[in-house]
Amino acid sequence: ARCEPPAVGTACTRLCRPRSAPSRCGPGLRPCAPLEDECEAPLVCRAGCSPEHGFCEQPGECRCLEGWTGPLCTVPVSTSSCLSPRGPSSATTGCLVPGPGPCDGNPCANGGSCSETPRSFECTCPRGFYGLRCEVSGVTCADGPCFNGGLCVGGADPDSAYICHCPPGFQGSNCEKRVDRCSLQPCRNGGLCLDLGHALRCRCRAGFAGPRCEHDLDDCAGRACANGGTCVEGGGAHRCSCALGFGGRDCRERADPCAARPCAHGGRCYAHFSGLVCACAPGYMGARCEFPVHPDGASALPAAPPGLRPGDPQRYL
């Protein structure tokens, strides 16, 4: 087969700009070019054939990879029909999973669907687009290509492109995509973003307020911790790190470190500025009087694990 405008090259892969309105190539031919450049007519699968799960060996057909069925290979087959799959299988279906192919990442622009061919890929372009990758637009403003109230500029003649100026909340070359404004994560401090179409709303977590949950209602500003305590922010609330001997939300409550009777075996507890101190009864030792002292002078410390000497610091669980 020979190339037809507007593609050039030995495989009709390079495009040339048509002098007038773009010509429609015959079915099964890529948009192509001068007669001296020869190319093979690529395999064009059935329109709509799934680029991921379908392929063709004859023009127009849509043959399904294992695990898929339907006219366009869009329907997963139940695992019962994949009892003895050949090749790598999917854990979810038990069916053959195709490896990476030329359509991975979808090389077709402007909403074109990609079909694998024996040598490369083929793009099935939506109406108004053509070219190897559907990158050339044959649409003008007269066709009304801008959706959702987009303003069309340019494109007075078939060879010139058009540009859609999209209204707020829409994007894409044809303003066809609603902007997911919440993907920009405008709500601070863990607020929940709600796109209402006409506006964004942030649903704030407890302790935060403002249009973007930017105000911390429970912050340390204007909040003093009593008795030398230090204010610490975090987790949508504030807390006070209290000085020794004080406790409570604002460190206003006097705390007695000896109230919990931390000294064992009758040891006496004394509150001290650096913490509590235990005065142990005769025959006991340790920070909390927890270890009995043996008459021969050896203490009943637990045996040290391998690699530690008995005198080394240890943590006992």
Epitope: P27, R46, G48, G70, L72
Partner: antibody
Framework: QVQLQQSGGDLMKPGASVKISCKAA????????IEWVKQRPGHGLEWIGE????????TYNEKFKGKASFTADTSSNTAYMQLSSLTSEDSAVYYC????????????WGQGTLVTVSA | DIVMTQSQKFMSTSVGDRVSVTCKAS??????VAWYQQKPGQSPKALIY???YRYSGVPDRFTGSGSGTDFTLTISNVQSEDLAEYFC?????????FGAGTKLELK
């Protein structure tokens, strides 16, 4: 442009067979599915099946297996549907249609063939 | 088989109105749905493919929407030539199936 020209209507006897033709023009006949659709008053549209002329591969609606069979002659760009063992239930308009080139579905239709089965 | 249900057999409208024809699939068909218009004594005419794309030459007052199981054909600014029967079709699964049709009539 794409054209599908169907054969004329037939009055058939019960038990007989009829072969409807669909001649295509304006495109590469081999490369696109020819679809066959039945329409009876009050029954809407029913898909009978399809044939890809280039490979001869066919897919039938289970409901019409044994009733309809498809063939295609690429030299004359003509698709055929044969209906066998006709009954009054087969009285209907039968359409051929072509699958789209870039867009899925049936953008091109023949004018229809009326088959009437009557004793 | 997938059943395409067009719950309204008839719909009354006036010229200039906006009317929506609905179609419900018995299971998920993605966007593999087409809409056709048929006038008495004529072959069906393709309007919409892939649920929301107009076939070439179809006026832009016809718009399609939906995915999964619920689909709608909307005709804004109805013209007298739009009075016809409308069929939806799924081509996601074999066998391909059509809805029973919705006839658009004048009030």
């Amino acid at each position: 442009q794409v054209q599908l020209q169907q054969s004329g209507g037939d009055l058939m006897k019960p038990g007989a067979s009829v072969k409807i033709s669909c001649k295509a023009a304006g495109y590469t006949f081999s490369n696109y599915y020819i679809e066959w659709v039945k329409q009876r008053p009050g029954h809407g549209l029913e898909w009978i099946g399809e044939i890809l002329p280039g490979s001869g591969s066919t897919t039938y609606n289970e409901k019409f297996k044994g009733k309809a069979s498809f063939t295609a002659d690429t030299s004359s760009n003509t698709a055929y549907m044969q209906l066998s063992s006709l009954t009054s239930e087969d009285s209907a308009v039968y359409y051929c249609a072509r699958w789209g080139a870039r867009e899925p579905g049936f953008p091109y239709w023949g004018q229809g063939t009326l088959v009437t089965v009557s004793a | 088989d997938i059943v395409m249900t067009q719950s309204q057999k008839f719909m009354s409208t006036s010229v200039g109105d906006r009317v929506s024809v609905t179609c419900k699939a018995s299971q998920n068909v993605g966007t593999n749905v087409a809409w056709y218009q048929q006038k008495p004594g004529q072959s069906p005419k393709a309007l919409i493919y892939s649920a929301s794309y107009r076939y070439s030459g179809v006026p832009d007052r016809f718009t399609g929407s939906g995915s999964g199981t619920d689909f709608t054909l909307t005709i804004s600014n109805v013209q007298s030539e739009d009075l016809a029967e409308y069929f939806c079709q799924q081509y996601n699964n074999y066998p391909l199936t059509f809805g029973a049709g919705t006839k658009l009539e004048l009030k």
